[in-house]
């Protein structure tokens, strides 16, 4: 039940990307929504051999990936702040999962180029806006209220049934002819049924 509701809420989430509002904004699709998460694409020029890429949320470092080469041209890839990431020959993708309203913010790709020189830092970014559709909002608002109301009705129903059962039981205990009267009623009913059949 819990997982079902969770998937429902994930389905309700929508992602809107507003780029071009800040200096150094990405001139490509920076955010790709899939599988209940977001892929944040940080591009770098093909010529770049060694670099550090940091994903910033506002001013906070969320993730980083550093690619360097040794004197034998062996590649080393390191992450100090680990996120699920993917490296290609011209981009680093960082993946964020379990999105909620707190993820809505400016995201920046902070690229430090070590090689080829000169050392250079570039910052590109965009705003990741997370909102929910009206239908989902309404459902999410009324669903708990409906559930609560259902629970209250069930509790009241149980109380009522218990009370009626208790009342009936107590009245039958106080009436000495109660059992006889009940038997007589059953016999009368049997008789009339037989009469109906013969006619």
């Amino acid at each position: 039940m819990k997982s079902g509701l969770w998937y429902f809420f994930l389905f309700c989430l929508r992602i809107k990307v507003l780029t071009g509002e800040i200096n150094g904004s990405a001139n490509y699709e920076m955010f790709i929504f899939h599988n209940g998460g977001v892929q944040i694409l940080c591009k770098y020029p093909d010529i770049v051999q060694q670099f550090k890429m940091q994903l910033l949320k506002g001013g906070q470092i969320l993730c980083d990936l550093t690619k360097t080469k040794g004197s034998g041209n062996t590649v080393s890839i390191k992450s100090l702040k680990f996120c699920h990431s993917q490296l290609s020959n011209n981009s680093v993708s960082f993946f964020l999962y379990n999105l909620d309203h707190s993820h809505a913010n400016y995201y920046f790709c902070n690229l430090s180029i070590f090689d080829p020189p000169p050392f250079k830092v570039t910052l590109t970014g965009g705003y990741l806006h997370i909102y929910e559709s009206q239908l989902c909002c309404q459902l999410k608002f009324w669903l708990p209220i409906g559930c609560a109301a259902f629970v209250v009705v069930c509790i009241l129903g149980c109380i009522l049934i218990c009370w009626l059962t208790k009342k009936k039981y107590s009245s039958s205990v106080h009436d000495p002819n109660g059992e006889y009267m009940f038997m007589r009623a059953v016999n009368t009913a049997k008789k009339s049924r037989l009469t109906d059949v013969t006619l």
Partner: antibody
Framework: EVQLVESGGGLVQPGGSLRLSCAAS????????MDWVRQAPGKGLVWVSN????????EYSPFVKGRFTISRDNAKNTLYLQMNSLRAEDTAVYYC??????????WGQGTLVTVSS | DIVMTQSPDSLAVSLGERATINCKSS??????????LTWYQQKPGQPPKLLIF???TRHTGVPDRFSGSGSGTDFTLTISSLQAEDVAVYYC?????????FGPGTKVDIK
Amino acid sequence: EVQLVESGGGLVQPGGSLRLSCAASGFTFSDYWMDWVRQAPGKGLVWVSNIDESGSITEYSPFVKGRFTISRDNAKNTLYLQMNSLRAEDTAVYYCTRWGRFGFDSWGQGTLVTVSS
Amino acid sequence: DIVMTQSPDSLAVSLGERATINCKSSQSLLSGSFNYLTWYQQKPGQPPKLLIFYASTRHTGVPDRFSGSGSGTDFTLTISSLQAEDVAVYYCHHHYNAPPTFGPGTKVDIK
């Protein structure tokens, strides 16, 4: 200012062991690959070994593979070279070098290792 | 392993004259748009010093009389106007793959 200071060199008998150290300062040690390069008296430069920033990748020259071990302690900003089964041909000045992304951009003054009986 | 050779072994040049050192590799050092070749200068009693990287890019603080050229397997270091402080041994070095190797060196003296 980048500084690399080697120590631990000396005279050792063939088959013996030595541990060289290189104290680094003036830069973020844990951001760089580091290497050892040696130079026999009156001869040319020979690359010995390297190690990546975290110490997880190491490479060796065929001349020393299996006998030498490179390591680093980023907390102490120190590079090491453990040399076992030393031979006469290992006699050289051993330089600690910083691999500055595209070349050996900083060198220590070197420490002399003499292997002789 | 890639073998690096240098020529000449030594040369003597007059002050202010041009000095040219050649370096040849046993296989191409070109990868993408980069030649993985560096040049070092070693003065007597001193550790080596990085001069040129990627075959033709001068390192920080290196005088512009030093220049590097070449691609693939053939490279050249040129000192356009030799100064007294340029007396040294010059080494070419590749970092195309492991193990990186140095050339045997070329000794430059003043005539």
